[in-house]
């Protein structure tokens, strides 16, 4: 199920309005074109290091290279969290850390990177060929996951080079899909721009919808779309958030900014409620991995300011991993 925002329809201009509206309507294609060209794909890197002092002790470091704000990091081993992996730690940027043996110490290194020390003794201690995965849930990018392990010939004290992600085996389909959509969008915008030279400036007008239709709704990524791809360790980013155009522009004309519900996302870094300010309508591709973003209109019960966790349409605990921790 995917909820679509109401996208205003293009209408011929009303007589006498071309001059007033022309410069405004020119802005939209250029803004979108710029965003098309600059839209970057976030990445996750994973570094696994065996400590020289304790041969079976590991340090895992993970980082997120993206512009969004991180809402949760999950570190697992034996494969990704949802695909047979076991959760080692869950880190929330404001609420803290839950960790599990053999994790000895999980911590935030920066606002976008974490480290996890695994102790080396006991039945659950890691071995050299163990795969460690880090999943970053961020807004607006969605969930991004990368996995890494020590190379077979690693010397103690050496680390595996950081594994960038989306890793090839995981995100090939997603990258192709994203590229296709972006390419199509950019070509279409160029086409619009070319037409614009030969026609009077069109005026954007909200499409006629029923009064019950919400003006801005979040998207609910399809759970099935990823399963159908059958890619192991996949974090396929295929769900595209429709840009919602704010029809209540104070100057009477349309606004070119996405209208986000103010409780849909908050930066964990500080108290500034950035979601209430206009944000460029970027075609953000979010992971369909765990249905992180659902109906943003439904706020979870007694969730604190700046800490909204996104509800899942299947119920309040449907998004939890094997830990019972989001």
């Amino acid at each position: 199920m995917r909820t679509e925002a109401q996208v205003p329809a293009l209408q011929p201009p009303e007589p006498g309005l071309e001059g007033a509206m022309g410069h405004r309507t020119l802005v939209l294609p250029w803004v979108l074109l710029t965003l098309c060209v600059t839209a970057g794909t976030p990445e996750v890197w994973v570094q696994v290091r065996m400590e020289a002092t304790e041969l079976s002790s590991f340090t895992i470091r993970c980082g997120f290279l993206g512009s969004g704000s991180i809402s949760l990091v999950t570190v697992s081993w034996g494969g990704p969290n949802g695909a047979g992996g076991t959760t080692l730690a869950v880190l929330h940027p404001e609420r803290g850390i839950r960790q599990w043996a053999p994790a000895r110490q999980a911590r935030w290194e920066t606002q976008s990177s974490i480290s996890l020390i695994l102790e080396g003794s006991g039945a659950s201690s890691p071995c050299a060929n163990t795969t460690f995965c880090c999943k970053f849930a961020s807004f607006p990018e969605g969930s991004w996951e990368a996995c890494g392990s020590l190379p077979p010939s690693s010397d103690p004290g050496l680390s595996a080079p950081p594994t960038p992600a989306p890793i090839l085996r995981a995100d090939l389909a997603g990258i192709l899909g994203v590229s296709g959509v972006l390419l199509f969008g950019c070509v279409y915008l160029l086409h619009l721009l070319r037409r614009h030279k030969h026609r009077p400036a069109p005026r954007l007008q909200p499409s006629r919808t029923s009064p019950q239709a919400p003006r801005a709704r979040a998207w609910a990524p399809s759970q099935a779309s990823q399963a159908a791809l059958h890619v192991p360790y996949a974090t396929i980013n295929t769900s595209c958030r429709p840009a919602t155009l704010d029809t209540a522009h104070p100057h009477g004309g349309p606004s070119w900014w996405a209208s986000l519900p103010t409780h849909a996302a908050h930066r964990p870094q500080g108290p500034a409620a950035w979601a209430s300010t206009p944000i460029p309508a970027r075609g953000s591709f979010v992971s369909v991995e765990n249905g992180l973003y659902a109906q943003a209109g439904e706020r979870p019960p007694h969730t604190g300011p700046g800490l909204t966790l996104f509800p899942d349409p299947r119920g309040p605990r449907a998004m939890e991993g094997p830990l019972g921790v989001r």
């Epitope: 076991t86 959760t87 929330h92 940027p93 404001e94 609420r95 803290g96 850390i97 839950r98 960790q99 599990w100 043996a101 110490q105 999980a106 911590r107 979870p300 007694h302 969730t303 604190g304 300011p305 800490l307 966790l309 309040p316 605990r317 939890e320 094997p322 830990l323 019972g324 921790v325 989001r326």
Partner: antibody, heavy 119, light 107 residues
Framework: EVQLQQSGPELAKPGSSVKISCKAS????????IDWVKESHGKSLEWIGA????????NYNQKFKGKATLTVDKSSSTAYMELRSLTSEDSAVYYC????????????WATGTTVTVSS | DIVMTQSQKFMSTSVGDRVSITCKAS??????VDWYQQKPGQSPKALIF???NRHTGVPDRFAGSGSGTDFNLTIRNVQSEDLADYFC?????????FGGGTKLEIR
């Protein structure tokens, strides 16, 4: 109604072991972690550790490693804590509590089990 | 380990008054602090989670604030049933640690 019901008071001899139970009801047992907390005179409250009923994964406060062992029985929705090699320092009230993973806090507490170690 | 310090072991107040209980963390714990109330002979009960959010059913006389290292629990219009011990807890890092507690006495 969500409830955590703990077993009754224990009187134990130094060097022996006790196993305290914590039976959950009113919710899906595997959806929430169970943590254990010690309340002793002069030491306020101390977090002992946590267990995930889903997979039996544990996390212990280093101070209680070797002292406490956390287990679960999914079929009876019961969490257990075994305390071994008991000394008078282990005389305390022990609580099991439910960790709300949506909001990250201990939302439900059991009534507690008093353990008295005396020869 | 992160040390949570509740400097006031006892606080005395009267019904109808406003009182603030403080808790200081030995390092930055963001907003990963909760407050629990323990009445005599009872188990602890959740009051405030993540620094400032009230647990379900907690009267709005109770309010939490703070982030980083300094946290406050404020009770306004104190009632006789508020006689209890109040503990802060950090879950920013393992092991989770509690403050030493503040006993609220009603004059």
């Amino acid at each position: 109604e969500v409830q955590l019901q703990q077993s009754g008071p224990e009187l134990a001899k130094p060097g022996s072991s006790v196993k305290i139970s914590c039976k959950a009801s009113g919710y899906t047992f595997t959806d929430y972690n169970i943590d254990w907390v010690k309340e002793s005179h002069g030491k306020s409250l101390e977090w002992i550790g946590a267990i995930d009923p889903n997979n039996g994964g544990t996390n212990y406060n280093q101070k209680f490693k070797g002292k406490a062992t956390l287990t679960v029985d999914k079929s009876s929705s019961t969490a257990y804590m075994e305390l071994r090699s008991l000394t008078s320092e282990d005389s305390a009230v022990y609580y099991c509590t439910r960790w709300d993973s949506n909001d990250w806090y201990f939302d439900v507490w059991a009534t507690g089990t008093t353990v008295t170690v005396s020869s | 380990d992160i040390v949570m310090t509740q400097s006031q072991k006892f606080m005395s107040t009267s019904v109808g008054d406003r009182v603030s209980i403080t808790c200081k963390a030995s390092q930055n714990v963001r907003s990963a602090v909760d407050w629990y109330q323990q009445k005599p002979g009872q188990s602890p009960k959740a009051l405030i989670f993540s620094s400032s959010n009230r647990h379900t059913g907690v009267p709005d006389r109770f309010a939490g604030s703070g982030s980083g290292t300094d946290f406050n629990l404020t009770i306004r219009n104190v009632q006789s049933e508020d006689l209890a011990d109040y503990f802060c807890l950090q879950h920013w890092n393992s092991p989770y640690t509690f403050g030493g507690g503040t006993k609220l006495e009603i004059r």
